[in-house]
């Protein structure tokens, strides 16, 4: 009797199990009682990355420089092109269809993780004992100056945005 299910890398059509096309090839014709599945390679600008019965290959992704994109890895008949962002930019989404500038960490925040082509800057609040007085995509929170090691005393306490202000010790005692 005709099959109702097929093996791996096969598909059921017209009560027959036909071989799927291998990655990098598209389906031209289903198999028959007398012939194998007919497949053709994808053209240079196209790909298919799985065993398939697609009648059209997918177009390689275009890395549009107007959107801040560049080619990280050229596509093949079996893989899509991988885009990444130009220096100073990162992908807006996982699919990386466009890029946006890395965000800077505002005063009071420091860089926890520097941005990459695919991830934005990660900022963290400066904890007690640390500060950041600049808006930067690179600078971490810096520790307050240690007045004691300079034989000075704290004249003005530090905040998450400002360093402590050191001054000479009062010698009029």
């Amino acid at each position: 009797e005709p099959p109702t299910a097929c093996r791996e890398k096969q598909y059921l059509i017209n009560s027959q199990c036909c071989s799927l096309c291998q990655p990098g090839q598209k389906l031209v014709s289903d198999c028959t009682e007398f012939t194998e599945t007919e497949c053709l390679p994808c053209s240079e600008s196209e790909f298919l990355d799985t065993w398939n019965r697609e009648t059209r290959c997918h177009q390689h992704k275009y890395c549009d420089p107007n959107l801040g994109l560049r080619v990280q890895q050229k596509g093949t008949s079996e893989t899509d092109t991988i885009c990444t962002c130009e220096e100073g930019l990162h992908c807006m989404s996982e699919s990386c269809e466009s890029c946006v500038p890395h965000r800077s960490c505002l005063p009071g925040f420091g860089v926890k993780q520097i941005a990459t082509g695919v991830s934005d800057t990660i900022c963290e609040p400066c904890p007690v004992g640390f500060f950041s007085n600049v808006s930067s995509a690179f600078e971490k929170c810096r520790p307050w100056t240690s007045c004691e090691t300079k034989d000075l005393v704290v004249q003005q306490a530090g905040t998450n945005k400002t360093d402590v202000v050191c001054g000479p010790q009062d010698r009029q005692r």
Epitope: S19, V28, S29, C31, T32, E33, F34, T35, E36, T37
Partner: antibody
Framework: QVQLQESGPGLVKPSDTLSLTCAVS?????????WNWIRQPPGKGLEWIGY???????NYNPSLKNRVTMSVDTSKNQFSLKLSSVTAVDTAVYYC?????WGQGTLVTVSS | DVVMTQSPLSLPVTLGQPASISCRSS???????????LNWFQQRPGQSPRRLIY???NRFSGVPDRFSGSGSGTDFTLKISRVEAEDVGVYYC?????????FGQGTKLEIK
Amino acid sequence: QVQLQESGPGLVKPSDTLSLTCAVSGYSITTNYYWNWIRQPPGKGLEWIGYIKYDGSNNYNPSLKNRVTMSVDTSKNQFSLKLSSVTAVDTAVYYCARLDYWGQGTLVTVSS
Amino acid sequence: DVVMTQSPLSLPVTLGQPASISCRSSQSLENSNGNTFLNWFQQRPGQSPRRLIYKVSNRFSGVPDRFSGSGSGTDFTLKISRVEAEDVGVYYCLQVTHVPFTFGQGTKLEIK
């Protein structure tokens, strides 16, 4: 329902070219089937002559050497056979077939 | 070429009794995808060949279930579980795994 119908002269002179056409109805010829020619000399078994596909790709029986030419006309949904330099041994019923469907056959006699 | 050898060439059978036809190929008919393109055809007197079995054991639609095919590699069998009067004719195996396609020489089934 798929139907195949052979047509062509029933009598061919020795050394001439035998020409037959097969009209296909009920199914488009532009599919992944082999469109075959098979012959059967009187009182004998079946002999495969060759096949052609919708894209013109073909395979012929080497025993018929370089005498066979097949063509396909997708606009008319038909395919054809030419067999050159015929002799009496080419006298046979000629079938066109998709293998699951066959024409009724046409007897071609080679005689002067 | 792949040589297809059928046996017996003549098969007298009593109505209602089983019948078995063997077909052997000179090389394996299994292709790289694991498919074996071995077919069986019936040719009743004065008619075109009719499809029975494809890919060793698959019955074409409309073929009675008293017909069954089996085998693998180079050894194949067509069985008729209970022969009926309408089964009289010549039975051919055909391989379409290798080009040129080749038929067996035919087995003539007749009623005793």
